[in-house]
Amino acid sequence: MMTGTIETTGNISAEKGGSIILQCHLSSTTAQVTQVNWEQQDQLLAICNADLGWHISPSFKDRVAPGPGLGLTLQSLTVNDTGEYFCIYHTYPDGTYTGRIFLEVLESSVAEHGARFQIP
């Protein structure tokens, strides 16, 4: 039975040209995390593998940085970066936990962080 929950940074906004940290946290489970994937729609951004460490997808190697922790830092943001981002925790023996973050990249300087929320 999957008992864990993923807490994410929720709906967030940031300025064009700036950077943003995407964060997820898996709690309420003793399952072992084997890898965490970060994906934007169907596009792989990064993988953190328990044995090998971080891999940034080569298409994003110049503007995605690993961390902090299991989070991901997006740099040099463009309006095209607006959209859904998913943290996918692969665990044993529980299986897969997925968290969702919506990022809006704004042209103006009125970028505010949304509230944190939980996805069971």
Epitope: L44, I47, N49, H55
Partner: antibody
């Protein structure tokens, strides 16, 4: 530690078929790796031939023009290369290698070929 | 077909810095890998994903990538570093994977 050992005939006749096997020890052929073949003609550089993932997915060098087939034998913990319509240009040292990946489910996130066999020499001659 | 271009040879004196370049049109959006092959031996992975060094590889080996050029740097080259060095990457569609022509490093 992980070891790879190539085996096969040292001499192949032109127009024949080359069959090579790579025995894997210290790791499971079913683990999350690309199992690869690379060759090196005498006095020349390295040439990537192709690879197979434990799921059965394969990638090949287009220059082989569909002459190559890579397969896995899980019961023997080994993988193989078959190359048809052999010519003198296929004379080379053939290496097998393990390429690790970060995404253990899909094979995405290429780490690199971190373990190699010592190579086996194949000569094509009549 | 996709190509990676390397200089055929590079020579340095012991203790000097050796730089081996690799150029390819897809390198801005692909990773470069570097393999060392000493005479009569199998290749060894010395740099992966542009700049990462596998465990057991000396710190004098480093990698970098900028635009269409990847560079392997050996800081304080030693006689035992004399070998052929191959860059390796993929084309813009992900496959096939391809080796550069190789660079013979002479340390004398």
């Amino acid at each position: 530690q992980v070891q790879l050992q190539e085996s096969g005939p040292g001499l192949v006749r032109p127009s024949g078929t080359l069959s090579l096997t790579c025995a894997v020890s210290g790791d499971s052929i079913s683990s999350s790796n690309w199992w690869s073949w690379v060759r090196q003609p005498p006095g020349k550089g390295l040439e990537w031939i192709g690879e197979i993932y434990h799921s059965g997915n394969t990638n090949y060098n287009p220059s082989l023009k569909s002459r190559g087939t890579i397969s896995v034998d899980k019961s023997k913990n080994q993988f193989s290369l078959k190359l048809t319509s052999i010519t003198a240009a296929d004379t080379a040292v053939y290496y097998c290698a393990r390429a690790r990946v970060y995404d253990i489910l899909t094979g995405r996130g290429y780490y690199g070929m971190d373990v190699w066999g010592q190579g086996t020499t194949v000569t094509v001659s009549s | 077909s996709y190509e990676l271009t390397q200089p055929p040879s590079v020579s340095v004196s012991p203790g000097q810095t050796a730089r081996i370049t690799c150029s390819g049109d897809a390198l801005p959006k692909k990773y470069a890998y570097w393999y060392q092959q000493k005479s009569g031996q199998a290749p060894v992975l010395v740099i992966h994903e542009d700049r990462k060094r596998p465990s057991g590889i000396p710190e004098r080996f480093s990698g970098s990538s900028s635009g269409t050029m990847a560079t392997l740097t050996i800081s304080g080259a030693q006689v035992e570093d004399e070998a052929d060095y191959y860059c390796f990457s993929t084309d813009s569609s992900g496959n096939p994977r391809v080796f550069g022509g190789g660079t013979k490093l002479t340390v004398l």
